[in-house]
């Protein structure tokens, strides 16, 4: 979380935003609050982004105002126009790019004063991971799948039984670059696995954590997957 | 509510440059929240994007026609205007111009459209 | 640039009916999509927008679902008024592009 106060000049106003990660492709959302003011039209919004140097966004006298928006966030970025009078500046961005990446700066004017507070965005690739029995093995073999990640993750198996067990003997792990030559499949296969035990394939990179877990039993199987993103800060 | 006109002449000659001007009445083309676009629709067939254009004049074409179009906008007239060069009859259709959403980027309302054919 | 396939080509439906219509995209566009309705001689009019969300005067029966690369538009009882072509477009990226179209004609 990051809080950042006014400058100079008229009060201060108390501005929030909090470090997010956006998954490539998909649509992301960089949080901003502040202190609401009673009018619209005195709420300025500005978004900026270090090293860029037109505007990502900017939303004055209740409505956006583009013309000093840089070229690759155009027909890209919405602020909800409705939530702003209740100090929510947060921007909506559109298929997040790799290069979306870095530090940007939520800028507010009210009637009250001014205000601003970074936020570092992340941009990776990440995705549910899905384990499944695999039949046409000669053994007893699980199939861990995950469609998108970036970068490289690391592929790491468990078991409730063998707490502690290192199963990177009997696992294979490999990455497979997806068509748009930036994200990869993961596909990671457990040999020699057991009845009556839940395994889990955890996957990591420096943006997400995601587990997949799956208990076998002689009359069924539970599947379970879970995803996390790291390093969620507010400022 | 909102209505916009597209306008110019109906027939053009094979190699020589398409050109429509779009009226919108209802509101103002300054609004900050919306670009304008041109959209065109060859007969019988589907939709094509052809660009858009904001109030302040910063423009975005579809890159298979880029470098043909040229828009521009008059804001004291209200208007938006689109010029097509080198027009072959592939470039015969009906002409639309709409309001299009700054994100999500829909397009509402269209003018009623133009066709404009391409023919010596 | 991104490819909308739209299925079928012509839907025939009796009035009262439900009418399913398809689009599909070549890569994922979340859920940045748009459904649209021509009629005859007519502009095409806005529906539905962000995948799901219905244009304010557009009737209940209209509904848009789907995300990634599949999507659906659904009429859930026809009227006599809702015989025309449905478009979709995507907005993900730029250029937009537009399906080519289904045909929903009386049975």
């Known amino acids: 979380l990051i809080i950042g106060f006014g400058i100079s000049g008229r009060h201060s106003i108390t501005v929030t935003t909090v470090a997010s990660a956006g998954n490539i492709g998909e649509d992301g959302i960089l949080s901003c609050t502040f202190e609401p003011d009673i009018k619209l039209s005195d709420i300025v919004i500005q978004w900026l982004k270090e090293g860029v140097l037109g505007l990502v966004h900017e939303f004055k006298e209740g409505k956006d105002e583009l013309s000093e928006q840089d070229e690759m966030f155009r027909g890209r970025t919405a602020v909800f126009a409705d939530q702003v009078i209740v100090g929510n500046a947060s921007l909506r961005l559109k298929n997040v790019q790799l290069t979306d990446a870095g530090t940007y700066k939520c800028y507010i004017i009210t009637s009250k004063g001014k205000g601003n507070a970074n936020l570092e965005y992340k941009t990776g690739a990440f995705s549910m991971p899905e384990v499944n029995v695999d039949y046409n093995a000669s053994s007893e073999t699980l199939r861990c799948e995950a469609p998108r990640w970036f970068p490289q993750p690391t592929v790491v198996w468990a078991s409730q039984v063998d707490q502690g067990a290192n199963f990177s003997e009997v696992s294979n792990t490999s990455f497979e670059l997806n068509s748009e030559n930036v994200t990869m499949k993961v596909v990671s296969v457990l040999y020699n696995v057991t009845i009556n035990n839940t395994y889990s394939c955890m996957i990591e990179n420096d943006i997400a954590k995601a587990t997949g877990d799956i208990k076998v039993t002689e009359s069924e199987i539970k599947r379970r997957s879970h995803l996390q993103l790291l390093n969620s800060k507010a400022s | 509510q909102l209505q916009l006109q597209e306008s110019g002449p109906g027939l053009v000659k094979p190699s020589e440059t398409l050109s429509l001007t779009c009226t919108v009445s209802?509101?103002?083309?300054?609004?900050?929240?919306?670009?304008w676009g041109w959209i065109r629709q060859p007969p019988g067939k589907g939709l094509e994007w052809i660009g858009n254009?904001?109030?302040?004049?910063?423009?975005y074409y579809n890159p298979s026609l880029k470098s043909r179009v040229t828009m521009s906008v008059d804001t004291s007239k209200n208007q938006f205007s689109l010029k097509l060069s080198s027009v072959t009859a592939a470039d015969t259709a009906v002409y639309y111009c709409?309001?299009?959403?700054?994100?999500?980027?829909?397009?509402?309302?269209w003018g009623q459209g133009t066709l404009v054919t391409v023919s010596s | 640039e991104i490819v909308m396939t739209q299925s079928p080509a012509t839907l025939s439906v009796s009035p009262g009916e439900r009418a399913t219509l398809s689009c599909r995209a070549s890569q994922s566009v979340s859920t940045n999509l748009a459904w649209y309705q021509q009629k005859p001689g007519q502009a095409p009019r806005l529906l539905i927008y962000?995948?799901?969300a219905r244009v304010t005067g557009i009737p209940a029966r209209f509904s848009g679902s789907g995300s990634g690369t599949e999507f659906t538009l659904t009429i859930s009882s026809l009227q006599s008024e809702d015989f025309a072509v449905y478009y979709c477009q995507q907005y993900h990226s730029f250029p937009f592009t537009f399906g080519g179209g289904t045909k929903v004609e009386i049975k």
């Open positions: 709409a309001r299009e959403g700054s994100y999500p980027n829909w397009f509402d309302p």
């Open positions: 254009i904001y109030y302040s004049g910063s423009t």
């Open positions: 209802g509101g103002s083309i300054k609004s900050g929240s919306h670009y």
């Open positions: 962000d995948a799901s």
